[in-house]
Every structure is written in C-alpha cells, then in structure tokens.
C-alpha cells in the first residue's frame, strides 16, 4: 500500500531572466526512493539516481542546475518556460509517487510564490 | 571511429569468478557511461549494470548485486565486469556497451563490444 | 522494475512484406523507447532511439511510433538483411530493461 505524500512548492510564479527553484518532497513513507525524474511536457529535464547521483539532460544543461536537495534550479528564465512540472519520485516497494509544480514566468516583477500543497 | 573490443572466451568452474575486460577508443572514454547485458544461450538481453567512467561510480541490476562489480581504468580506457560465484547458468554471452548520450545514463546503446562467451562447467 | 513486453514472440515473413512489432511498457516511459536488431552470433544493434529517432545509418524503411505504454516497430518493405530477432528496451529509468525479443523469420 503507498502510504507517501509529496509535497511540493505549488503554484510559482517568476521573473522572465531570473531562476526559480522547483521543490519536492516525499513524506509518510519508508520507501527506498531509486530515482527522482524531473519531467516538463514528458521530456526528462534532469534525474537523481540512488547510486549514480545528478544528471541533467543534454537538451537542458546550459538552463538547469540540480539541486538543492532533490530539487531543481531553473535558470535564464523564458516565457516558453510557462507550464507543467512534474518530479516523479520512483521507489521500492511502494512504486510511483508524482508531484507537480505549475510555473508561470513573468515579463513584469510581480512574480510572488503561490502557497504550498500536497498531492497524496 | 568507436570501438568496444572485449577479451577472450573463458571458461570456468562452478564457484570461481571470471573478470571480462572491455577497451573502448574512437571517443572520450570519460564522457560516456558503459552497460554490461548478458545474453544466455538462446536467451533475451539482461541488463546487469552501468559504470560511469569518469567517477567510477556503479549501479546494478537487483538479480546480480552482490556478485557483480564494475570498475574502470581510465589510463588504458578499459572497463572490467567481475562476476562472481559462478553457476551453470551463468553460461552466456557478456556484451559491453556504450551509451548514446554524453553524461547520460539512460540514453539507449549506440555501440557494444563484440561479446564475450563465458562457459561455466565441472 | 519497469516490465517490457514485446508482441508476437516471433513471426514468419516473406521479402517486400510489411512488418509490425509492438512493444508495451508496465508504466508510462513517455518516448523513452529503444529497438535494437540482433543478428546470430552478433552484437546488438540500435535501430531506434526516443521511439522514433532513427539511428545514422539505419535504413529508412524501418520507423519507430508510440508513447506512454505502448510502441511500435515498423519495417515497411522486409529486406532479407532485416531477418533477426528486435528487442524493445525502456531507458526511463534505471535499470534499462529488454523486452523478450521477436524473431522474425523467413516464411
């Protein structure tokens, strides 16, 4: 039975040129976690792997930094950079656990963080 | 142009351990993370593990941890798959194999070695 | 671990035929998708890679579709170089994982 939550930074918002940090975290499970895919429109951005450590994709690596944590930095920021993230959390013996973040990037400075919630 | 060239056939007895070389060149030996699959006879690919050459650090297929190791020597551009604690049905073809993508483990195979058979038997 | 599982196991063709492999993931893998040829006695080959890349060099006769869970290898017009056996592999996460091959025969 998957007992997990993830829980995530939520809805983000940031200025187009800055960086953002995307965050995930597992709780309330004693699942081994063997990998953290980061996923943006079903491409792989990065992955953490329990033995062989960060790798960011090559499509993505002048743009985006690992870390901190299990989390990943987004840098340069553009308006195409709007959308969907996702950290898909894969672990023994519970499975899959998925998390998603939605950024949007602003022209203006009103970019502010929205609150914080749990996907179960 | 890139090659993966591997050692000899062996043959060993049950219980003993056999150590299979895989000398790559035609790239940077450091860039490219190597895969070891072995291929029983008749059988489909079994992937066993991974090697990043540059740091030398590992990972393992479950069925085969604790009895496999992986290591590197960046100075001769070779990486070794160790097998231990042989049993019949570890006879079987082992193939290196490079991956396709720079610093990526999981990019798919774009060149293997041409494969080693090992036989164990009393 | 992510299951691969390929359909049929094996298959009898005649040259000029239309040849259509599937492959199905036990979880979503998104594109990431690999088919290899392997010929007796030989090494594997990549053929496909990210589901439809077609490798330098490889014929374009052969074509790579799918997402998510399910997948297909296509050889438009079978050549008598193209009997072997096509292994499907996910390369999602790690461990990479094979589907159990289909054998492509000559009818």
């Known amino acids: 039975m998957m007992t997990g939550t993830i829980e995530t930074t939520g809805n983000i918002s940031a200025e187009k040129g800055g960086s953002i940090i995307l965050q995930c975290h597992l709780s309330s499970t004693t699942a081994q976690v063997t990998q953290v895919n980061w996923e943006q429109q079903d491409q792989l951005l990065a992955i953490c792997n329990a033995d062989l450590g960060w790798h960011i994709s090559p499509s993505f690596k002048d743009r985006v930094a690992p870390g901190p944590g299990l989390g990943l930095t987004l840098q340069s920021l553009t308006v195409n950079d709007t959308g969907e993230y996702f950290c898909i959390y894969h672990t023994y013996p519970d499975g899959t656990y998925t998390g998603r973040i939605f950024l949007e990037v602003l022209e203006s400075s009103v970019a502010e963080h929205g609150a914080r919630f749990q996907i179960p | 142009q890139v090659q993966l060239v591997q050692s000899g056939a062996e043959v060993k007895k049950p219980g003993a351990s056999v150590k299979v070389s895989c000398k790559a060149s035609?790239?940077?030996?450091?860039?490219?993370?190597i895969h070891w699959v072995r291929q029983a006879p008749g059988q489909g690919l079994e992937w066993m593990g991974i090697?990043?050459?540059?740091?030398?650090?590992?990972s393992y297929a479950q069925m085969f941890q604790g009895r496999v190791t992986l290591t590197r020597d960046t100075s001769t551009n070779t990486v070794y798959m160790e097998l231990s604690s042989l049993r019949s049905e570890d006879t079987a073809v082992f193939y290196c194999?490079?991956?396709?993508?720079?610093?990526?483990?999981?990019?798919?195979?774009?060149?293997w070695g041409q494969g080693t058979l090992v036989t164990v038997s009393s | 671990d992510i299951q691969m599982t390929q359909s049929p196991s094996s298959l009898s063709a005649s040259v000029g035929d239309r040849v259509t492999i599937t492959c199905r993931a036990s979880?979503?893998?998104?594109?990431?998708l690999n088919w290899y040829q392997q010929k007796p006695g030989k090494a594997p080959e990549l053929l496909i890679y990210?589901?439809?890349n077609l490798q330098n060099g490889v014929p374009s006769r052969f074509s790579g579709s799918g997402s998510g869970t399910d997948f297909t290898l296509t050889i438009s017009s079978l050549q008598p170089e193209d009997f072997a056996t096509y292994y499907c592999?996910?390369?999602?996460?790690?461990?990479?994982?094979f589907g159990q091959g289909t054998k492509v025969e000559i009818r």
């Open positions: 194999a490079k991956d396709r993508e720079e610093q990526w483990p999981v990019g798919g195979f774009d060149y």
């Open positions: 035609g790239y940077t030996f450091t860039s490219y993370y």
């Open positions: 090697i990043n050459p540059s740091g030398g650090r590992t």
């Open positions: 979880q979503n893998i998104r594109r990431y």
């Open positions: 990210s589901a439809s």
């Open positions: 592999q996910q390369s999602y996460i790690i461990p990479p994982t």
